[in-house]
């Protein structure tokens, strides 16, 4: 169950998709990736207040137990619900190759 | 790529499966669940240091960018990699029913 999308903490403060620009050097990829030289990394960042974008029953349980035992049970966490693929031109033993990575760019976010 | 399982922070401090005992009242289920009265909730808790149990390429990127921009990019988060089903006896309009929930109890954990 994907729960409420209204953020009680104010606009943009809850779990959502953010874009962070990163170079190959930033990512530690400079020695094995030729292209792209810069990646617009989409990732999930933000708070997960009670029932906000709860991914499933487990997330709902986590919210309840966090309220009861905040020192033991952490709040749900903002993570990718799905991904966009990304194609890299990478170095290989024989030269270069195109490689698709299916789990690189977040497409959608939820709390779990 | 599921990366290293060695925790550099010390035994038990990194992302792993924990069990938290919770009553139906704790979970807010007392009005719709008859059984079990108490649930051994398995959940993923712990830190996600560099490359520890990295779920995928996205988690590896997140680690790299968190190192560079800790105020902007959070560290990867400890979440379920898979779930165990759980059967609840729940109240219905006509009486009671058995219902299996596939996404209630964490079975295995990773960092993302």
């Amino acid at each position: 169950a994907r729960n409420g999308d209204h953020c009680p903490l104010g606009p943009g403060r809850c779990c959502r998709l953010h874009t962070v620009r990163a170079s190959l050097e930033d990512l530690g990829w400079a020695d094995w990736v030729l292209s792209p030289r810069e990646v617009q990394v989409t990732m999930c960042i933000g708070a997960c207040p009670s029932q906000f974008r709860a991914a499933n029953m487990h997330a709902q349980i986590k919210t309840s137990l966090h309220r009861l035992k905040p020192d033991t049970v952490p709040a749900p966490c903002c993570v990718p619900a799905s991904y966009n693929p990304m194609v890299l031109i990478q170095k290989t033993d024989t030269g270069v190759s195109l490689q698709t990575y299916d789990d690189l760019l977040a497409k959608d976010c939820h709390c779990i | 790529a599921r990366n290293g399982d060695h925790c550099p922070l010390g035994p038990g401090r990194c992302c792993r499966l924990h069990t938290v005992r919770a009553s139906l009242e704790d979970l807010g289920w007392a009005d719709w669940v008859l059984s079990p009265r108490e649930v051994q909730v398995t959940m993923c808790i712990g830190a996600c240091p560099s490359q520890f149990r990295a779920a995928n390429m996205h988690a590896q990127i997140k680690t790299s960018l968190h190192r560079l921009k800790p105020d902007t990019v959070p560290a990867p988060c400890c979440v379920p990699a898979s779930y165990n089903p759980m059967v609840l006896i729940q109240k219905t309009d006509t009486g009671v029913s058995l219902q299996t929930y596939d996404d209630l109890l964490a079975k295995d954990c990773h960092c993302i």
Epitope: S35, P36, G95, L98 | -
Partner: antibody
Framework: EVQLLESGGGLVQPGGSLRLSCAVS????????MTWVRQAPGKGLEWIGI???????YYASWAKGRFTISRDNSKNTVYLQMNSLRAEDTAVYFC???????????????WGQGTLVTVSS | DIVMTQSPATLSVSPGERATLSCQAS??????LAWFQQKPGQPPRLLIY???TLASGIPARFSGSGSGTEFTLTISSLQSEDFAVYFC????????????FGQGTKVEIK
Amino acid sequence: EVQLLESGGGLVQPGGSLRLSCAVSGFSLSSYDMTWVRQAPGKGLEWIGIISSSGNTYYASWAKGRFTISRDNSKNTVYLQMNSLRAEDTAVYFCARGILVYADYGDHNLWGQGTLVTVSS
Amino acid sequence: DIVMTQSPATLSVSPGERATLSCQASEDIYTNLAWFQQKPGQPPRLLIYAASTLASGIPARFSGSGSGTEFTLTISSLQSEDFAVYFCLGVYTYISAEGAFGQGTKVEIK
């Protein structure tokens, strides 16, 4: 000697299908990406698509849906399946090793001689 | 879709002169660009890859430059065997990958 040899071209009616082959020798196909390119008579080069060493395929937007690239590493052969052919698909079809914009180690310019496909009724 | 635009369509140059060919990409393709020479009845011949690296066996009078969206092929002193058609090829990668050739520049004897 490293070689690429295209075959399977010929005359085909509009709406018909054809499968082109690119047989390679002198290297192990499994380690390389392979590209298909075509050239209509008297016209420029047109990029069709690539099959990567891992088997992923990438196509020009105009080729998606009608053209399919595949490979059989055990036969050291790459294929181009062309469906719903039209007169404007008449061209010489080339296969080439690599992604072309970066060089593989060793030979930098491995192209076949091409095979002519004529679509006409 | 990525579009590669070459200019000029035809370049008339005297032997021994310098020739400068341009190629523009519709997307930022970094250095994912190659230059090819083609003569009638032959497959293309790779001259430059990675925008500026000379392919093996290619004379040093050929050079490439540029990155992003603007690229140039320079032939410092044209020889008789250099009169041919030249094509640029760009490959754009992000969520998928797609390549495109420019329409070609014919270098002819002035």
